[in-house]
Amino acid sequence: AGVFELQIHSFGPGPGPGAPRSPCSARLPCRLFFRVCLKPGLSEEAAESPCALGAALSARGPVYTEQPGAPAPDLPLPDGLLQVPFRDAWPGTFSFIIETWREELGDQIGGPAWSLLARVAGRRRLAAGGPWARDIQRAGAWELRFSYRARCEPPAVGTACTRLCRPRSAPSRCGPGLRPCAPLEDECEAPLVCRAGCSPEHGFCEQPGECRCLEGWTGPLCTVPVSTSSCLSPRGPSSATTGCLVPGPGPCDGNPCANGGSCSETPRSFECTCPRGFYGLRCEVSGVTCADGPCFNGGLCVGGADPDSAYICHCPPGFQGSNCEKRVDRCSLQPCRNGGLCLDLGHALRCRCRAGFAGPRCEHDLDDCAGRACANGGTCVEGGGAHRCSCALGFGGRDCRERADPCAARPCAHGGRCYAHFSGLVCACAPGYMGARCEFPVHPDGASALPAAPPGLRPGDPQRYL
C-alpha cells in the first residue's frame, strides 16, 4: 500500500507565439482545480477508461480575475498535493491523465459552472520510494509543470511497496531469513504471510503463500528435520555434544542482494539474481538495458546490450523523448482557432471547440445560444463567444443538467433560513429583512438622520452583509 503524490507547480501559457486567452475575466472571474487519473501499465487507453489505480481531485484554487489587456499569466493554483492512495503493489509503470478544470464564478444564482480547460496524458516508469520526478506537459497553448512520486505507507517498503517492515524485536539483528529494511536500518523486514502451517521457526517465504526451509529442515511445511546420520554438512565446526557439524554462517545469510534480488549459494561464494532494472554483484546498481524494454509506443531499442553502455530509442512517427514516451505535440502549432482545445489522438488531430464555435478547426462563429438548449427550464445568456445558462432553481452546472440542493449555495441573505421546497426554495428572513431572498434590509443598520450613505461608507462603497 502507498500513495501517489502529484504537486502542480504552474499552469499557464506555454512558450512560443499565440498566448492563450485568459480563462477568466473581470466579467467572469474563475478559479482552477485539477483532476488526476492513474492506470497501471503502459497501455494506450482511452481517456474515459476507468482510473484503475485511483483518481484524485484538488481543492479549488484562489479566485482569479484577468487584468484587462494583460496576457494570461500563470494562474493561481490550489494549495497542497493531489494524493492517490493505492492499496496493492505499486506497478512501477503507469499511465496518467491530468485535467485542468475551470470553475466559473459568474453572478448567476444557479451556482458555478465547470469546464475542462486542458488535459495532458503520459506513460512513465516510476519506482516507489524514489525522489520527486519533474515533468512538463503541453496541451495546446497551455503548459503544465508538475512533480510526482510514489511512496509506500508503513509498514510497506521497496520499489513496489510489497515488502513489509517492522521495528526490531532484538537490538542486534533481524530474525532468520529477514533483512534489515534499508533505509530504516533500525527496522527489519517483516515476515510475509507464508503458506498456512509453514513452520515459524524453520520456514520462511519470499512470496506470499510459499514455504521455504532453513538449512536442516525439509518438507512442505519445513517441519521435517533433514537426516543427520551422515553429518556431512560441508561447513562449520563439530558439535561436541552430537558429533555432527552445526551449520555456521552461510554466504547468503542476511541476504546480501539489494533491491529485491534473490541470493543463491555457489561453491565459492554467492550469486544474486537481480530484478529488472538492477545489476551488479549485489544488485546494487540501477541500470536499464534494452532487455528491460525501455522504449515505449513501439520504439526500437538500439545498443545497451550490456549495462555499461547506454541504449537509444528510435521512436516511431508521432512520438519523441528518450523513451518515446511523449507524443510529438502537433497541438503546439495551435491549429484550433477561437480558443478551441486541441487533442492529439495519434491518428488524427481533434479540436474541442468552445461554446459558440464549430468546425474542424473551430473556425465557424455560431450564434452563442443557437441550438444550445439549457436543460430543466434554464435560459441561455449570450456573451463573449460562450453561452451561459441561467438555471432554474434546483439545477446547476453549465447546461443546468445537474440537480442541485437549492439551499447549498446559501441563497438566503442576511442570515435568512433556507428551506428546500418541491417548487424550489423558501427563505425565512431574519427580523428586519425582506425580499424573496432576504436581500433587502428594511432599515439599513445605523442609518441615522440624513447621512449621505450608511455610516463609515462613501456612497457607492460596498458593505458586506452575510
Partner: nanobody
C-alpha cells in the same frame, strides 16, 4: 466593483408622477438584487421597493399600488415609477444593489425628490 448612479429626482406637485433611474456598472442588473430606499429629513433610511435577481418584487405598504419597480437588462438599469405622489414621499432616494457572488451591498449617491405645492 459595482457603481450605481441615480437620476430623475426633482420638484413635483402632490398627485404628480416621477420616474427615478439607477444605472449600474460593474455587473449585470439581472444578476443583482436591487432596491430603492429613501431617507426623509430627521428619519431613518427605509426600504421602498426591491426587485430580486429572480425578478420577484417587494414594496412597503405605504407605496403599494402607487410605485412600481422595474428592470431593463439591456440598459443595465433599474427604475422606480412613482405616481400619486404625496408630501410624505419627500426624501432623498437611494439606489441599492446586493451582489450574490460576493454578498456585498452597494449604494448610490442619492437623488432628491421634493413633493410640494
Amino acid at each position: 466593483e459595482v457603481q450605481l448612479v441615480e437620476s430623475g429626482g426633482g420638484l413635483v406637485q402632490p398627485g404628480g408622477s416621477l420616474t427615478l433611474s439607477c444605472a449600474a456598472s460593474g455587473s449585470k442588473v439581472s444578476f443583482l438584487s436591487m432596491a430603492w430606499y429613501r431617507q426623509a429629513p430627521g428619519k431613518k433610511r427605509e426600504l421602498v421597493a426591491g426587485i430580486s435577481a429572480d425578478g420577484s418584487k417587494d414594496y412597503i405598504d405605504s407605496v403599494k399600488g402607487r410605485f412600481t419597480i422595474s428592470r431593463d437588462n439591456a440598459k443595465n438599469s433599474v427604475y422606480l415609477q412613482m405616481n400619486s405622489l404625496r408630501a410624505e414621499d419627500t426624501a432623498v432616494y437611494y439606489c441599492y444593489a446586493y451582489r450574490w457572488t460576493t454578498r456585498l451591498t452597494y449604494w448610490g449617491q442619492g437623488t432628491l425628490v421634493t413633493v410640494s405645492s
